[in-house]
């Protein structure tokens, strides 16, 4: 941290490393809950026209489909990976890709992804071709 | 050497607006993105806006949106923070930063270089 910068205690808005540098925060979508017409894609973009600075540095980017007999929605947010978010563990925040993932939620079917990109949530992949060692 | 130099802040009552400048020297400005943050007294710092360095794509925290507008000349190697319909809250010492795009951590414990600040004061 810069000698002319206060430190503050508890102070989770700045991460640094053991040699004091710093993280910059994510860049995410962050539209909150939006209608979508997403539906049997392999991929989908958000349409969420909001770019959003992460308000903490370890947050990562989230996207959440849900489906139900009503309607179809997107949920773009920022979201401390440490955090349930839906109940559910952040379990693949590292990944530079959003890679949907399904979630038993009786009543919906449910998918959420989690990435730490720049506004890797604007893209949503449902493809099973996509995976985790998938270099791209 | 590089150098960050921000000015433009001052005392200004709730409603009213500032400029801010940050004045780059030392570095090939158009090869980095910029960022405004800020750090109320007393707390922790707050990143409030970031502009890319062409096409000047720009960010904001979900806090300011609406009201700051960020920009660069990149001419002028400046950066500049317009902050409209001001708060108390958005009372703090404003920061200018450089960030290589693309890397999520500083070279160093200097934040790759910040500037020395400038205060806003919002109060009646």
């Known amino acids: 941290i810069p000698p002319h910068v206060q430190k503050s205690v508890n102070n989770d808005m700045i991460v640094t490393d053991n040699n004091g540098a710093v993280k910059f925060p994510q860049l995410c979508k962050f539209c909150d809950v939006r209608f979508s017409t997403c539906d049997n894609q392999k991929s989908c973009m958000s349409n969420c026209s909001i770019t959003s600075i992460c308000e903490k540095p370890q947050e990562v980017c989230v996207a959440v489909w849900r489906k139900n007999d009503e309607n179809i929605t997107l949920e773009t947010v920022c979201h401390d990976p440490k955090l349930p978010y839906h109940d559910f563990i952040l379990e693949d925040a590292a990944s530079p890709k959003c890679i949907m993932k399904e979630k038993k939620k009786p009543g919906e079917t449910f998918f959420m992804c989690s990435c730490s990109s720049d506004e890797c949530n604007d893209n949503i992949i449902f493809s099973e071709e996509y995976n985790t060692s998938n270099p791209d | 050497e590089v150098q960050l130099l921000e000015s433009g802040g001052g005392l200004v009552q709730p409603g009213g607006s500032l400029r801010l400048s940050c004045a780059a020297s030392?570095?090939?400005?158009?090869?980095?993105r910029m960022w405004w943050v800020r750090q109320a007294p007393g707390k922790g710092l707050e990143w409030v806006s970031a502009i890319e360095p062409i096409g000047n794509r720009t960010y904001y925290a979900r806090s300011v949106m609406g009201r700051f507008t960020i920009s660069r000349d990149n001419s002028k190697n400046t950066l500049y923070l317009q902050m409209n319909s001001l708060r108390a809250e958005d009372t703090a010492v404003y920061y200018c930063?450089?960030?290589?795009?693309?890397?999520?951590?500083?070279?160093?414990?200097?934040?790759?270089?910040w500037g020395q600040g400038t205060l806003v004061t919002v109060s009646s």
């Open positions: 030392g570095f090939t400005f158009t090869e980095y």
């Open positions: 930063a450089k960030q290589i795009p693309g890397r999520k951590w500083t070279a160093n414990s200097r934040f790759d270089y």
